[in-house]
């Protein structure tokens, strides 16, 4: 038999199907050009010493074989006695280690069947009613094509499916979509009504997202606040990847899932934005305000389930770092500056109440005055602050305050608010004899003791009212009793006691009279 | 290891008040935020309140004002006080731990260490 043709004699080797479940597969045969056809086809196991032959059978029952050797790709005209008009069913044999492997039959008309391509370049993704619909540009001149998917997941193999016929410029399938794995398809075409015509090779590989992106599983930690007045968080635990099929792995675009930090900062409600989503890679610095922190999983199908945080405000307090001055204007307050063109944001709020009650107040950029402080003023009429109780200020500043991630804290402290030195006057004051010259003086706490730092001392004042002498003690802010001593038997006496805070002296208290009885000997 | 056994649930009048304990054993138990969520049958669990290591707290809305949360680090507990319940607070309630700096989640997912639970039913 010359090579060129199908030899009608029996082939070289015993007809015996060994039936191993290697072999040669996927066979697919097509017209070329006007006289020439293609066979090719896959052979899966060890290819050394391996024969094949494409066997060839006519509706006459005449059979033939073309030998191929080691190649897996054959070419013949339509003069190789093949006939290409009528139908034919053909196969490959192949030899190997004294056994015959077989390929499943196809059963074609040779010169009606056109090598159809798989879909190329893009394959468009998306879900329509809870299904996976891909779409993709029809090859050129392939308009009419029945197609097929398979699809695997990390765990499972792959599973055939129908896409129907399609007979327009855009092809299309709809697919199934799992919820919680991400998948592999490949897409194949074969020309339509063309009975028994090859598949074309399968496609890239397409890889699909689950249908609900992982619930990201971090955890954080916030550093303590640094001189510069900001706190690191830090990511302790990244999100745990999405498992793979095997030909996503590597580079498998579409499968990626995006985890972005969304940061709230509760504290400073005035300033112009409180909300800033952050790449997860990308750790910010924060003030020592109240955040709520969520991480937010996201694939191309949307976002997925929140992981959420709440960051406390870091209530570490400078007592010293602030001064104020109340004046018959106003009260106007002062701390170190930070740097040139600031925008600092005060918040206060009534100690013990709720965080949803701080009222903040936004100064315009200022750079420090000569003395290297910043200042910020109000008036009596504003109401800020004026109510005669414990208020607790936090000072933020900022370069950018619409950058959210660039504040930071310029001081933490308590402020007793109103008028300071009235309020703070101790009551209830009492005085009960201790021995033969002294007494013991008892007041009830000052209000300004409910305010951590702001109360300096007591001051006891003690007058002789026959001598007019005036004698004072000072007395730690934790103490609300003292002895006086020294004190003479049938003498009047007033005491009174002061609240003084930092910068600001107290007002007495109502004056207490006493005097210790002369003692008369029996 | 942290194993976490809460007790202190039961049937109160709407109104009333129940103080929660949560015993923690097998770790470092000042090194890690505390948390208390609750859940009803069939609906996701939801976060009560927190309390980071250094006693900074967090209360969700629903529960801001009436729930205190506090703990004592000597004796490794943790404490939700309950007071002027609801019929909307029966639920059963879970202690939770998470080995974290100064960072209370507020979602299920973000703790580590669960608690078996202890169920409270308040009655209308």
């Known amino acids: 038999c010359r090579t060129s043709e199908c030899c009608f004699q029996d082939p070289p080797y015993p007809d015996a199907d060994s039936g191993s479940a290697s072999g040669p597969r996927d066979l697919r045969c097509y017209r070329i050009s006007s006289d020439r056809y293609e066979c090719s086809w896959q052979y899966e196991g060890p290819t050394a010493g391996v024969s094949h032959f494409l066997r060839c059978c006519l509706s006459s029952g005449r059979c033939c074989y073309f030998a191929a050797g080691s190649a897996t790709r054959l070419q013949f005209s339509d003069q190789a006695g093949v006939s290409v008009l009528y139908t034919v069913t053909l196969w490959v044999e192949s030899w190997a280690r004294n056994q015959t492997e077989k390929s499943p039959e196809v059963t074609l008309q040779l010169y009606n069947s056109v090598k159809y391509e798989p879909p190329l370049g893009d394959i468009k993704v998306s879900k329509l009613a809870g299904q996976l619909r891909m779409e993709w540009e029809t090859p050129d001149n392939q308009v009419g094509a029945e197609v097929q998917f398979r699809h695997r997941t990390p765990s499972s193999p792959w599973k055939l499916g129908d896409c129907g016929p399609q007979d327009d410029d855009t092809e299309s399938c709809l697919c199934p979509l799992e919820m919680n794995v991400a998948q592999e398809f490949q897409l194949r075409r074969r020309q339509l009504g063309s009975q028994g015509s090859s598949w074309s090779k399968w496609s890239s590989p397409v890889c699909v997202p689950p249908e609900n992106p992982p619930q990201p599983q971090v955890r954080f930690s916030v550093e303590q606040l640094g001189q510069d007045g900001r706190r690191r968080l830090t990511l302790k635990e990244q999100p745990t990847q999405l498992e793979l099929p095997e030909g996503c792995q590597g580079l498998a675009p579409g499968t990626e899932v995006t985890y972005r930090l969304q940061l709230h900062m509760l504290s400073c409600p005035c300033k112009a934005k409180a909300t800033r989503t952050l790449h997860l890679g990308k750790m910010p610095y924060l003030s020592g305000a109240a955040y709520n922190v969520a991480v937010i999983s996201s694939n191309q199908f949307g976002p997925g389930l929140n992981q959420t945080w709440h960051i406390p405000a870091d209530t570490h307090t400078e007592p010293v770092a602030l001064n104020i001055s109340v004046g018959t204007n106003g009260t106007t307050m002062y701390w170190p500056a930070r740097a040139q063109s600031m925008t600092y944001c005060i918040e206060w709020q009534p100690v013990g109440q709720d965080g949803g009650l701080a009222t903040c107040s936004l100064t315009a950029p200022q750079d420090p005055d000569p003395a290297g402080m910043a200042t910020y003023s109000w008036s009596r009429e504003s109401g800020a602050m004026g109510q005669e109780k414990c208020y607790y200020i936090t000072i933020f500043a900022s370069a950018h305050p619409e950058k959210l991630t660039l504040w930071s804290t310029v001081l933490s402290t308590y402020h007793f608010g109103g008028n300071a030195s009235a309020a703070g006057t101790p009551h209830h004051v009492s005085v009960k004899n201790h021995s033969l010259d002294s007494v013991s003086v008892d007041w009830a706490p000052s209000l300004l003791s409910t305010c951590p730092g702001v109360l300096k001392e007591y001051v006891v004042r003690c007058r002789d009212e026959d001598s007019k002498q005036v004698s004072e003690h000072p007395v730690q802010p934790t103490e609300t009793q003292v002895t006086l001593s020294g004190l003479r038997a049938g003498v009047a006496y007033t005491v009174q006691v002061r609240a003084d805070t930092a910068w600001l002296r107290g007002v007495w208290s109502q004056p207490q009279r006493f005097s210790i009885e002369v003692q008369v000997s029996d | 290891q942290v194993q976490l056994v809460e007790s202190g649930g039961g049937l109160v009048q709407a109104g009333g008040s129940l103080r929660l304990s949560c015993a923690a054993s097998?770790?470092?138990?000042?090194?890690?935020?505390m948390g208390w969520f609750r859940q009803v049958s069939g609906k996701e669990r939801e976060f009560v309140a927190g309390?980071?290591?250094?006693?900074?707290?967090y209360f969700a809305d629903s529960v801001k004002g009436r729930f205190t949360i506090s703990r004592d680090n000597a004796k490794n507990m943790v404490y939700l006080q309950m007071n002027s319940l609801k019929p909307e607070d029966t639920a059963v309630y879970y202690c939770?731990?998470?080995?974290?700096?100064?960072?209370?989640?507020?979602?299920?997912?973000?703790?580590?260490?669960w608690g078996k639970g202890t169920l409270v039913t308040v009655e209308p």
């Open positions: 939770a731990a998470v080995n974290s700096f100064g960072v209370i989640p507020t979602s299920p997912n973000g703790m580590d260490y």
């Open positions: 097998g770790g470092p138990f000042s090194g890690y935020v």
């Open positions: 309390i980071t290591g250094i006693s900074s707290t």
